[in-house]
């Protein structure tokens, strides 16, 4: 297994719908066909994985149908979009990254991005 | 909150081995720097080997180098230290520690570790 640098911003506003967006960018050493991205969530001294998508080079990124992310891919770039966020699920947004094909493995982390997500106040009441 | 709890010590014979097992109690050691120390009667608590949270980076004092070896075993949340060509100085408390680090540590052991467990008696003697 050999390491790999992954870049990723520091800090992400989720909108008032609860969205998030961020790249995730990777320094490919060699000429990878398969590809997977897994989106960890720190918080609480305790990681878990938010979601994950395994693609193919040139092909659109795939995650399973209950998934709260999307997300496409460009060359070395991988665009990710989390939904369905609240107050409750700021926390740090790790990137992972593994090169699984061709050989060798390689293995990226970010250092995270800390997605903030702030409830909306509701509407108050109206005559109109 | 986690807890770690050891299991596997005993007493064994010099040259035989043991395997020590570091477990997370409410929640996972997934990405953790996990450590293994030991104390001996009147000896300092001394660190014998770590683990990184990727499980990519392992470290182990000298004293136990070739003879043990540490590894990640995601599927049942735990840390394995496995022993071998026990001598009589290996005798002690053994301690599992662990930190979760800062990702861009995550290939890294921890220099420092805010849980510790209970501990878990080895004794190697004829």
């Known amino acids: 297994c050999k390491a790999m640098h992954v870049a990723q911003p520091a800090v992400v506003l989720a909108s008032s719908r609860g969205i998030a967006s961020f790249v995730c960018e990777y320094a490919s050493p060699g000429k990878a066909t398969e590809v997977r991205v897994t989106v960890l969530r720190q918080a609480d001294s305790q990681v878990t994985e938010v979601c994950a998508a395994t693609y193919m080079m040139g092909n659109e990124l795939t995650f399973l149908d209950d998934s709260i992310c999307t997300g496409t891919s460009s060359g070395n770039q991988v665009n990710l979009t989390i939904q369905g966020l609240r107050a409750m699920d700021t926390g740090l947004y790790i990137c992972k990254v593994e090169l699984m094909y061709p050989p060798p493995y390689y293995l990226g982390i970010g250092n995270g991005t800390q997605i903030y997500v702030i409830d909306p106040e509701p509407c108050p009441d109206s005559d109109f | 909150q986690v807890q770690l709890v050891e299991s596997g010590g005993g007493l064994v014979q010099p040259g035989g081995s043991l395997r020590l097992s570091c477990e997370a109690s409410g929640g996972t050691l997934d990405y953790w720097s996990i450590g293994w120390f030991r104390q001996a009667p009147g000896k300092e608590r001394e660190e014998v080997s770590c683990i990184s949270g990727t499980g990519l980076r392992t470290n182990y004092a000298d004293s136990v180098k070739g003879r043990f070896t540490v590894s990640r075993d995601n599927s049942r949340n735990s840390v394995i230290l496995q022993m071998n060509s026990l001598k009589p100085e290996d005798t002690g408390v053994y301690y599992c520690?662990?930190?979760?680090?800062?990702?861009?540590?995550?290939?890294?052991?921890?220099?420092?570790?805010?849980?510790w467990g209970q501990g878990t008696q080895v004794t190697v003697s004829s």
């Open positions: 520690t662990g930190k979760l680090l800062h990702p861009s540590l995550w290939s890294a052991c921890a220099n420092e570790y805010d849980l």
